[in-house]
Structure formats: C-alpha cells, structure tokens
Interface confidence: low
C-alpha cells in the first residue's frame, strides 16, 4: 500500500460498500500522487479502534463516547478531523448538554434530589450519560445497578428505553418507557415536552432543543438552564452554563505516525468534490443504503482539529469526568480533608525545585506537577492533571479562552489592606541604554530586541500590539534585525540573540538565560538595543540589588525609557513614559477548584508570604533571587479579585481587545485549540 493511502475502517457491509464507492470516486478526481483510500472492514467500532492502534487501519469516524474509548490506553488515538453542521460561516462541531428547568421552579443543580426528571433515553449522551455521570457521586448507595440508584435519586422519571418492569420509577412520567417516537416523551423534543407539560421538573437535552421547540423568545424566556456552580442562566447563555460540551462526530487516528495531515488532505479534497450539493453521482454525507454510513448524513463538511488538541482537551473536563464516573464507578470514600491538596504547575527544573520546597513546607497542602512550557501547564490544569499556577496577563487571556478562571491577583505595592485591594496593574516599558542616544520609539526598525517571552504582556503583547498597529503585519522577526523572544520558532531571527544551550535555546522557561523580566534585561545589558519589560525591572537589577556577576555593577542611571511620543525619560519617570498599563499576574484554576485554591493559597501566604522576614533560613513563597519562580519576586501578597472573577473582567476590555487584535499574529497552538472548542 503506497504511503499516501488512508485505510478507512468500515463497520458493516453497507459501510464497506460506501467506502469502496468513496475510494473509486476519489481516484477519479485526485491526481495519482495525491491521497487515496483503501477500505478495511471490521465487526465493530471497538475493533476499528484496535485496528488503527495496531496500524492495520488509519481512520474511522466516532461519536464522543467512542472517542473516549479510542483515547484510553493502549489505544491512544487522537481526534484529527471534526464533522461540522450548520453553515460554513457558522460551523457547529460541538453541542452542549444542558439541564433545562422552568423559570419559577426555584431549585439549583445541588437540589435535584427528589425532583422529577425527563431524559432523552437510557444510555444517550446528553439525556443520560452526562447528567447521570456528573451526578454519580451524589447518587444514593449502592450505585449499582445504576438505574435503581437513579430511580431512588429522582422522585419520578421518564427515561425511554429503560426496563419498566425492574425500574418502574424510571417510567413513571411516561408509562411503558417506549424506545421510539411512539413515546411522546422520547428523544430531545420528547424530553423537553415532558418538562413543558409539567410532568417533569428538569429535562436533560442539548442546547438547541429549546430553540427547535420554541420559536418565540417570549416562550423561551419561561425556561432557564441549571449551571454546575449552582446558579441559573437564560437559555441562550448555554456556552457559559452547561453540563458538558460534546463533540458531535470525529475522525480519529494514531497519536504517533497517525497520518493526520494526509487524512485532512484526503477529507478536504473529498468535501470539495463530494460534499454537500457538490456531485450527483457520489455524496459523502448521504447514505442511500442505510443511515450515517462513514459520516453523519446531517454533516455539512469537515474542519481540521488543531494538532495541539488531544482527546482529553477535545472532549473537555466535564465530559471526561462524567464518562469516567460512569465507567469506573468509583467515588471517594470521604473527602480526605476540607480540600484536596492543590497541584501547582511548575515550569521546568528551577520552578520545580522551589515548588518541591514549598510542598514540603506546606505539609501536604501543595503538590507539584511539572511542565516545560506555560501552555503545557495550562493544558494540564484544564484536564485535571494540575490545579493552579500564577500567570502573566497574556497567559491569563489564553487560560481564560481555555475555560480557566482567575482566582487571586499578585499585588506589588505594600499597603495596609493588601489582600483586599487588587491593584490597577503595572507599567509595560521599553528600556534602552543611555549611551544609545539616537534610539527612539520611532526608529526601532533593524534594532536588536529583548523580550520576556512570546505571549507575555510587557515583553510581547503590548509592544508587539503597538508595533502591529504601525506596520500592519505580523513579521516582527523582519522588523527587528535579531532578538531574543523565548517561545519563537527556533530558526527565527528572534531566537538569534538567546543564550540557552542546545535544546534550551529560546525555550520559554528558566533554562533560557534571557527568559522573563530579568532575562530580557540581561539580554539588553549583554547584546540588545531595547528590552520590553515591567517598570520595576531596572531598579530590581541595578545598584547591587541583583548579586549575579552580569548585574552586580549596573547603575540605573545608565538606562532610559522610550516614550510613545518619540522622547526618552529617566527610568524613575515610568508613570509618564510607558507603553501601557498591564494587568498584574494572577493565579488561575478550573472553576470547580476555585474555592479550594482560594482558601489554601490564602493560608499559604499567611505562613510563607512577605511577612517572613528572614528568607535565608525560612521558605519564602515570593522570593527566588530575581528569577520570578512560581510568582513574581516583587509580590507583596495575593489579593482577592472581588467581582473581577472572569478573565475578561480581570484583564479589562482594553487589554482583551489588544490581545484579540494580536491573535492574527498568534503562534499559540493552545489558543488555537481552545478557540476551536469555543470560537
């Protein structure tokens, strides 16, 4: 089989027939050096999954539940292409599983016990697996058989397809529990009708159900959604209030050597020639000899799943939690303590050392998880492998787009009420050597630049956002002659000035000596023309305050700031000569860990915060010899956010807009993956 062949897995005679037709029609439109199809027939989807893992086939399209199976070891498959529905302009690749209630019913998610429930059908995703999976550990014991536990949890239900003899309560609202449209409460519309008629108190459906059944907004306004944080939201706010976000139908392939680019090339060409309304003789999204053969008949096309996205990220934390609960059926005997230990994400070797020291001192309240880049850490927090970390505003933006929430903010000024007063922010500045007297904001082209890291606020988002507005393109590596911007592509001129050795060169962590605020300033001192840092960086590293050999003899007076009006000012005049105000760094976590992270961090800073006077003999949370490990070294305390508890509110409209404008220049694979889940 030539290397450009995609071996498609079919699970029935009818699918195999359609696959052969797909193969033959693709041959007729694709040049001989292009991708081709071969067909492999297996008895079931699980057999297909095993065949792909064993390199006997390359691709198959699966529902969400099977994507989870495909991801589990030893299969280790990943999503590579998603079917979309709706229009090309507004493609829908996911649906949201929601809990719909009547507006005046007055109960929350944590008050469902004893209510009457309407389900689309036993074993179906939005109507059963997701809500019951998420409620699993609240079901009365014994939880097996599951139907009995559910019957004892709700005071009555309609769960079509359930066994009405063994579990009559599950059929109480729809006598007989009929498993077809003959049962008026079957399926999405049926479950909603069960709620609408007043038979049930809550309907577990998908977000579009209510719109499909109630065309009139006034009618829809009589209903609300239950959110996982025990609040309610209007039905059109399903993106912020759902039980899980579920992919509709997805092509999977091997994680390693999985031909994902070839599969995309094949399907992209296939949709061009045989997609919706393209060809009479063969239609990709049509099944004359059955239903949903190879692909869903209702699909409109394909979208490439961003390469950064593994199955866990694609399926989402809530969905994975629900399915894992149902599959594994284990619940903690009792919570081990008021809060489980917070798993802190540490970047590379230096942060891990400090984190381990913190962990020992915290007596089990903090545990450490390592990752090589900030984005890897954010991904680990998303999927539950880690819980929290402190981030620069640029990464708070990415984390927010990925569904994480800010929980506490670093404060940098001493005040009586530090923990209660989050600050307005710090200043992003451009520093130059006083001796380079002809250098201004207006003639930076061709100069050597030093950045904290790509995607960070003072070092990248603010200066590059301003620059983008001026030059209207993203080729910053052409604007500067060379530089060090950790996180850039290794062959970019913006890695040329970096000092890391071997694989560590230009890495966005402390293994690269020019990483972060201190690193960017060092880059200016030793090689560069301009450094983009925060207003405190120069004073913190001059006048003997940084004992490292490169810094110990530096004098603040030898550096100046570039102002946006083309003038220059002394370093201490940052308030009148800066690029923008930057939001302080903030701790982020998942919504479900917000309360515990808040509590434990406040305890930890009382023990190890800036009230500790002697850091030579004691652990200090906010100290690391100017390396800004885990937190910025000038942090005085972690402050409550009050109502600024979403990434948009925390960062502020202006900054979110600035970063949004820079998105077209973004090289962030994680941001690309998260915007795929939530455009």
């Amino acid at each position: 089989v030539p290397d450009k062949t995609v071996r498609w897995c079919a699970v029935s005679e009818h699918e195999a027939t359609k696959c052969q037709s797909f193969r033959d029609h693709m041959k007729s439109v694709i040049p001989s050096d292009g991708p081709s199809v071969a067909c492999v027939k297996k008895a079931s989807y699980l057999d297909c999954i095993r065949a792909i893992a064993a390199n006997e086939a390359d691709a198959v399209t699966l529902d969400a539940g099977l994507v989870y199976d495909a991801y589990l070891a030893p299969n280790n498959l990943k999503p590579v292409v998603a079917e979309f529905y709706g229009s090309k302009e507004d493609p829908q690749t996911f649906y949201y599983a929601v809990a719909v209630v009547k507006k005046d019913s007055g109960f929350q998610m944590n008050q469902l016990r004893g209510k009457k429930s309407c389900h689309t059908g036993l074993g179906r995703s939005a109507g059963w697996n997701i809500p019951i999976g998420l409620l699993y550990c609240d079901l009365p014991e014994p939880r097996k058989p599951l139907e009995k536990a559910v019957a004892n949890f709700f005071s009555g239900s309609c769960a079509p397809c359930a066994d009405g003899t063994d579990f009559p309560q599950l059929c109480q609202l729809c006598p007989g529990c009929g498993c077809s449209t003959l049962n008026q409460y079957f399926g999405y519309s049926g479950a909603f009708k069960c709620l609408k008629d007043g038979a049930g108190d809550v309907a577990f459906v998908k977000h579009s159900t209510i719109f499909e059944n109630l065309a009139n907004k006034a009618d829809r306004d009589q209903y609300e959604l239950l959110c996982l944080d025990n609040t309610r939201k209007p039905v059109d706010e399903y993106k912020d209030c759902h039980l899980a976000q579920v992919p509709s139908h997805t092509v999977v392939a091997r994680s390693m050597g999985g031909k994902e680019d070839l599969i995309w090339e094949l399907l992209n060409q296939a949709q061009e020639h045989f997609g919706k309304d393209k060809s009479k003789e063969f239609q990709l999204f049509s099944s004359p000899h059955g239903k949903d053969l190879l692909f869903k008949d209702s699909a409109h096309g394909f979208l490439k799943v961003p390469p950064r996205m593994d199955a866990k990220m694609y399926l989402g934390y809530e969905y994975v939690t629900a399915i894992r609960n149902l599959r594994e059926g284990t619940c903690p005997e009792a919570p081990t303590d008021e809060c489980k230990p917070v798993k802190w994400c540490a970047l590379s070797h230096h942060e891990r050392l400090k984190c381990d020291e913190w962990s020992v001192n915290s007596v089990g309240k903090i545990e450490c998880v390592s990752a090589e880049t900030t984005e890897d850490c954010i991904a680990k927090i998303m999927n539950g492998e880690a819980d929290a970390m402190s981030l620069d505003g640029g990464f708070v933006y990415i984390a927010g787009k990925c569904g994480l929430v800010p929980v506490l903010a670093e404060n940098y000024n001493k005040s009586d009420n530090c923990e209660d007063t989050p600050e307005a922010g710090y200043f992003a500045i451009a520093v130059v050597k006083k001796s380079a007297s002809d250098l201004t904001w207006d003639n930076l082209k061709g100069k050597k630049s030093c950045h904290t890291a790509v995607g960070r606020t003072a070092g990248w988002n603010i200066p590059m956002g301003l620059l983008y507005n001026k030059i209207n393109h993203c080729r910053f590596d052409e604007f500067f002659s060379e530089g060090c911007a950790p996180g850039s592509k290794k062959d970019s001129s913006l890695c040329k000035l970096c000092m890391g050795s071997g694989l560590n060169l230009c890495e966005p962590n402390n293994k690269e000596g020019y990483y972060g605020y201190t690193g960017a300033f060092r880059c200016l001192v030793e090689k560069g023309d301009v450094a983009f840092v925060k207003h405190q960086t120069v004073p913190q590293n001059t006048g003997g305050k940084n004992p490292d050999p490169w810094a110990k003899n530096l004098n603040e007076k030898d550096y100046e700031l570039l102002c946006l009006d083309g003038t220059r000012k002394p370093v201490e005049e940052y308030a009148n000569c800066h690029l923008a105000r930057a939001p302080n760094h903030a701790v982020v976590t998942r919504k479900d860990k917000e309360a515990c992270v808040h509590k434990i961090l406040r305890q930890q800073q009382h023990l190890f915060g800036s009230n500790v006077t002697d850091c030579s003999g004691n652990f200090c949370l906010f100290r690391s010899e100017t390396k800004d490990l885990l937190f910025r070294d000038d942090t005085v305390c972690l402050a409550k956010l009050h109502d600024r508890n979403t990434y948009e509110k925390y960062l502020g409209e202006e900054y979110v807009k600035a970063v949004g404008n820079l998105r077209k220049c973004s090289t962030s694979s994680l941001l690309e993956a998260c915007t795929f889940r939530r455009p």
């Epitope: 929350q108 944590n110 609240d138 025990n230 809060c339 479900d592």
Partner: nanobody, 130 residues
C-alpha cells in the same frame, strides 16, 4: 425543600461555652452536608464547621480547631455546634446551612463556599463579652 431552625445562641463571657442546634426537616437528602457559617456586620459570611451527615466526617476552619466541635443526631435530623473557650472575636450571627454539594462537603467550609449552599436557616446571635 429543607427547613432549618437554629437555636442555642445568646450572650456569654469570654472563656464560656454555648451549644448551637440546627433542626432540619423536609428533604433530608439535600442536607447530607450540614454546615455552620457566621457573619459579622459588614463582613463576608465565613464557614466555621461542616459535617458530611452520611459519613459523620467533620470539617473545622483553622481559627476554631480545638475549641469547637460539630456533631449530629441522625434520629432527630439535628446538627450541633459545641463552642468552648469562646473569644470576643467569635461574636457574630451564626447560620445553619444545608446542601448535597455538587463538589464536596468540605467546600462548604471555605468562607467563599457559601455559593454552594442550597438552604439557609434564619440565624442565631452569639455575643461574647470580655
């Protein structure tokens, strides 16, 4: 729904003791997690103690450990807060709370875990004078 009725509040000298009671009636499953919160005027409501009634597992906030205990009488659907060695800073309105918490019972005991509470009592005043 769950109805919660607190009793046992009052005035006491520093170093003294009080025992608060909270009687739950109605849908007692929704009270599988019971907690005591307290609030001083102008301040946030803060968690003091919680108990997982199905397992008898107790949680206490650091400032009251060693002085307060939380217990239950399943037969009477009542939860107690025994407060010993009272200090003037314990003066507050004490509220009983119930939930079957979607996350975990300990989260009720967080001060900011108030958002996880399903039902509240009316409160009982505790005043400790020096």
């Amino acid at each position: 729904h769950v109805q919660l009725v607190e009793s046992g509040g009052g005035s006491v000298q520093a170093g003294g003791s009080l025992r608060l009671s909270c009687a739950a009636s109605g849908d007692t499953y929704s009270s599988k997690c019971m907690a005591w919160f307290r609030q001083v005027p102008g301040k946030e409501r803060e968690g003091v103690a919680a108990i997982d009634t199905s397992r008898g597992r107790a949680y206490l906030t650091d400032s009251v450990k060693g002085r307060f205990t939380i217990s239950q009488d399943n037969a009477k659907n009542t939860v107690y807060l025994q407060m010993n060695s009272l200090k003037p800073e314990d003066t507050a309105m004490y509220y009983c709370a119930a939930s079957n918490t979607f996350y975990n019972c300990g989260a009720l005991n967080l001060g900011i875990g108030a958002g996880l509470v399903a039902y509240w009592g009316q409160g009982t005043q505790v005043t400790v004078s020096s």
